[in-house]
Structure formats: structure tokens, C-alpha cells
């Protein structure tokens, strides 16, 4: 877009946005924050959804990878007129439902939720929000929270995956632009390359998976390398090493020349997967090479 940082990860990204009465005079800042962030997730395999909440949760834009639909979704988002209470759990309900139904036909795509709110949640509403965020997590989502102005950081740390998944914006709504870089860096899980990208047919290999965000998992012991072979069989392998910018994984033995393995990564023991355009292919290797 503007030469700024970008994310090439293929996953489902949900924005859950507070449109309660207290953000009435700050909706433009929220909109521009989402717009700037949305344009930086550039994988053709990335899908996005916009959900707003006040006294009700509403899905403004269902999950889509279509950039024209995303543009139209952003237009709808810009037109939102805030008002009502801060029923954050209603937003998470809409996200959980989409995660469940979108992934209940077989292949499970990883989900990342970025939830933004500006106020402290009263006791019951906090309980419901935490409960619904836990349901999203049970469905495999990674949950981040952006807190602006009068938020309660302790509450948001329990709604998000951890304290490290909370982005506090203490200087008011105009400071939202300042966290785009850090939220992009933290929420982006991407597979950029595999080394080697060509392996010998019938031989065992180790593959270095280059990328970002591999240690964003709630539990790094649950990170898996996944190889989708010839668009059919999927083999999951436990990595030998998990670092933020690379994984060291055993590659499956691919018996025949010309076989292709598309690289995926799971952050939750195979519950869902981050996809990529990275392919490992097999070639014939003569003895001694």
C-alpha cells in the first residue's frame, strides 16, 4: 500500500469493534485504524470479517477474501452510527458462530480476532465477554484486544489470550494510528519460505520454515508443521524447534518425483491451520549427490 509493513499470512481475521454510545465522536478514528490495518493483510488466502457491537452484535461483513467486498465492507463500516451499551460478548458470539460454521465442512482455517473497546465492562458483561472469548478460543482463535481510553487492562487481559495480547492506547483515540505497526507485527502469523524448497524423492529431510509469529501461540508445544500432499493427504509433524521467525521441521518422505507438499502451520495442535503459497517439491537425486 504505502510501503509500510505488511502481513502475508493466510488466515481468517475478525475485527470486533465497539460501536457503543461512548465512541460516538471517535468513530472516524476507529474506522481509519481498521482501514489502515486491513490494507496491510495482503495474502490472497486471507479472509476478513467486520463485526460491530453495542447492545447487539452485528456482522457488517461476513468472512471474505474478495478485495472488492472488503472495500465495500469498509464503506459500510465508515457509515456506522455508534450508540447503545457495551455488550462485547455479542460481538464474540457473532465471531464464534462464523468460525464454527465456516470451518465445519472439513478444512479448518486459523482465526485471529482483534477486538476493540473503550470502556470498562460491568461485572456481568465482563463475565459474558470472557465466556464468549473462551468459546472463540475453544474454536481455535487467537484473541487480541485493543483498549482505548477508559478500558480496564485486567479485564482485557482475561478476554484476550494473555496480557501480551492486549494493546493499550492510553492517549485516546487519535493515538490508535500509533499501534498499527505493533499490532500488525504481533497478530501476523505468516509462512514466507521453506529451505530447502526442493527435496529428494524417497529421502528424509528437515525443513526450515521461514516466517513470522510462530511463537504467538498460547502454547508453543502445540505448534505443528503441516504438509498437504498433492492437495489431498495432510501430514502433521511436530517441529524440533519453534522460534518467532522460523520452525525446524521433519519433512514427510515423499516417495515419487514431482510430488508437491503445500506448507501450513497449526498453532493449536491441528485444530486449525495457517495457509501459505509455499510449496515443497520432490526431484530425482542420483546417488552421492
Amino acid at each position: 500500500e504505502d510501503g509500510g509493513p505488511a502481513c502475508y499470512g493466510g488466515f481468517d481475521l475478525y475485527f470486533i469493534l465497539d460501536k457503543s454510545g461512548s465512541v460516538l465522536h471517535h468513530w472516524n478514528e476507529i474506522y481509519y485504524f481498521v482501514e489502515q490495518l486491513a490494507h496491510r493483510f495482503i495474502s490472497p488466502q486471507l479472509r476478513m470479517s467486520f463485526i460491530v457491537f453495542s447492545t447487539r452484535g452485528t456482522t457488517l461483513m461476513k468472512l471474505t477474501e474478495d478485495r472488492e467486498q472488503i472495500r465495500q465492507g469498509l464503506e459500510e463500516l465508515q457509515k456506522v452510527l455508534p450508540g447503545g451499551d457495551t455488550y462485547m460478548h455479542e460481538g464474540f458470539e457473532r465471531a464464534s458462530e462464523q468460525i464454527y460454521y465456516e470451518n465445519s465442512q472439513g478444512y479448518r482455517t486459523a482465526s485471529v480476532i482483534i477486538a476493540l473497546t473503550d470502556g470498562e465492562l460491568h461485572e456481568d458483561l465482563f463475565f459474558y465477554s470472557e465466556r464468549e472469548a473462551n468459546r472463540s478460543r475453544d474454536l481455535g482463535a487467537i484473541v487480541y484486544c485493543v483498549g482505548v481510553k477508559d478500558f480496564n487492562e485486567t479485564q482485557l487481559a482475561r478476554i484476550a489470550d494473555s496480557k501480551d495480547h492486549v494493546f493499550p492506547v492510553n492517549d485516546g483515540f487519535q493515538a490508535l494510528q500509533g499501534i498499527i505497526h505493533s499490532i500488525l507485527k504481533k497478530s501476523c502469523i505468516e509462512i514466507l519460505a521453506a529451505e530447502p524448497s526442493t527435496i529428494c524423492a524417497g529421502e528424509s529431510f528437515q525443513v526450515v520454515v521461514r516466517g513470522n509469529g510462530f511463537r504467538h501461540a498460547r502454547n508453543v508445544d502445540r505448534v505443528l508443521c503441516s504438509f498437504k500432499i498433492n492437495d489431498s493427504v495432510t501430514l502433521n509433524e511436530k517441529p524440533f524447534a519453534v522460534e518467532d521467525t522460523y520452525l525446524l521441521c521433519p519433512a514427510p518422505i515423499l516417495k515419487e518425483v514431482g510430488m508437491k507438499a503445500a506448507l501450513q502451520v497449526s498453532m493449536n495442535d491441528g485444530l486449525s491451520f495457517i495457509s501459505s503459497s509455499v510449496i515443497i517439491t520432490t526431484t530425482h537425486c542420483s546417488d552421492g549427490s
Epitope: 447487539r56 452484535g57 456482522t59 461476513k62 455479542e90 458470539e93 457473532r94 464464534s96 458462530e97 464454527y100 460454521y101 465445519s104 465442512q105 472439513g106 468459546r135 475453544d138 474454536l139 485444530l271
Partner: antibody, heavy 118, light 107 residues
Framework: EVQLVQSGGGLVKPGGSLRLSCAAS????????MNWVRQAPGKGLEWVSS????????YYADSVKGRFTISRDNAKNSLYLQMNSLRAEDTAVYYC???????????WGQGTLVTVSS | NIQMTQSPSSVSASVGDTVTISCRAS??????LGWYQQRPGEAPKLLIY???HLQSGVPSRFSGSGSGTDFVLTITSLQPEDFATYYC?????????FGGGTKLEIK
């Protein structure tokens, strides 16, 4: 009190139609997905159909696909099952059930008997 | 489509006994499995969700375990009201599927 009250069952001839209703009360109906499940006399439970909270996602069992239609009216807190081209093997007690996917069906209607016979 | 197989189809036990009912999925379903109790003439009742979580209001003598393809419902210290039919159900993917049921009878 959270409850689901069913109506619309009865005796119908093969090839006929019937519409089942399920009225919800005591909870925010528009926030929940809903299911229809049936049980033939003396048999086990069989899932029939599911609908998401805003009707965006709808699924049917192969045995009823093309003949049954699930729908809901959130303004009326009601769930429906329109059953067309009924067959003898559709004879069963039909239950509506509230669901929070993927946590299971936590509230059930009392059931309504549909008998398909000439 | 995922098939759910329950065993045994029926079991006899006495008040105070412990019983276990098994459920096997034809393919992995993570932990998206529920257990239901159905008494004669009544609607089913959710006992356990997500394989091991006790539904609110259900006595702690009911417990569930398992993940992937193999699951177990355990009822300890059987009470007279526990004699009923039990069903497992997968919610991992559509079409949703129930097991064939296990009838728990008084010995």
C-alpha cells in the same frame, strides 16, 4: 424460565406437507443457533437440520435435503420446519433444540409427533 | 460423513455401581463431543459438552473423557433416576451425528 414450546405435529398422508413451529422464551433467541432433531418410534436420535442465529448458515441431513426447509423469525422468537413430500420413514417425534456451537444442544422442546400414513 | 459408534448397546447395573459407556468416531473430531441422557417419554438432556465439560445443573457423578476418536462417559454411584438411554453426538462437522444409544437398565 428458558423454554422451547413446539406445535404443528399431526397425521399427514404420504406426499403431504406439514409445518412445525418452535416458540422460544426466556433467552435472547436471536443470539443462538437452532437445530431440529427427530426420533422414529423405538429408534435413536437423528439430526435433521441446523440454522445459525441470523440464518446465514443452514444445513440439512441428506435424508431430508430438498424436501424440508428450516427457517426462523427472530422478531417473533420462532423457529420453523417446513416439511414437504413427506414419506412414511419421516414418522417420528421432532424436537427443536437450542445450540451454542460447538458446545451441544442445551435446551430442548417437548417434542411433537409427526405421523405419515395413508 | 462421520459415523458415531456406541458400545455397549445396553448395560445392566445396580444402584451404587459405576458404569462406563464408550463412543467411537469414524474420524478425528477433536473434543467436539456431547453426551445426552433420555428418559422414556422425555426430551434428551445435555450432560457433557466438549467431551469433558459438565453441563450446568448436572450432578458431578457424570464425567466425560477422550479426544480425537475415542470417548467415554462414566457414571459413578448410580442413582435410580440414572436408568435411561444415553447418546453421544459429534459437532465437529456437518452432517451432525448421534451414536446409536446405550440403554442403561436396572439389574
Amino acid at each position: 424460565e428458558v423454554q422451547l414450546v413446539q406445535s404443528g405435529g399431526g397425521l399427514v398422508k404420504p406426499g403431504g406437507s406439514l409445518r412445525l413451529s418452535c416458540a422460544a422464551s426466556g433467552f435472547t433467541f436471536s443470539s443462538y443457533s437452532m437445530n431440529w432433531v427427530r426420533q422414529a418410534p423405538g429408534k435413536g436420535l437423528e439430526w435433521v437440520s441446523s440454522i445459525s442465529s441470523s440464518s446465514s448458515y443452514i444445513y440439512y441431513a441428506d435424508s431430508v435435503k430438498g424436501r424440508f426447509t428450516i427457517s426462523r423469525d427472530n422478531a417473533k422468537n420462532s423457529l420453523y420446519l417446513q416439511m414437504n413430500s413427506l414419506r412414511a420413514e419421516d414418522t417420528a417425534v421432532y424436537y427443536c433444540a437450542r445450540v451454542r456451537p460447538p458446545y451441544g444442544m442445551d435446551v430442548w422442546g417437548q417434542g411433537t409427533l409427526v405421523t405419515v400414513s395413508s | 460423513n462421520i459415523q458415531m459408534t456406541q458400545s455397549p448397546s445396553s448395560v445392566s447395573a445396580s444402584v451404587g455401581d459405576t458404569v462406563t459407556i464408550s463412543c467411537r468416531a469414524s474420524q478425528g473430531i477433536s473434543n467436539w463431543l456431547g453426551w445426552y441422557q433420555q428418559r422414556p417419554g422425555e426430551a434428551p438432556k445435555l450432560l457433557i459438552y466438549a467431551a469433558s465439560h459438565l453441563q450446568s445443573g448436572v450432578p458431578s457423578r457424570f464425567s466425560g473423557s477422550g479426544s480425537g476418536t475415542d470417548f467415554v462417559l462414566t457414571i459413578t454411584s448410580l442413582q435410580p433416576e440414572d436408568f435411561a438411554t444415553y447418546y453421544c453426538q459429534q459437532s465437529n462437522s456437518f452432517p451432525l451425528a448421534f451414536g446409536g444409544g446405550t440403554k442403561l437398565e436396572i439389574k
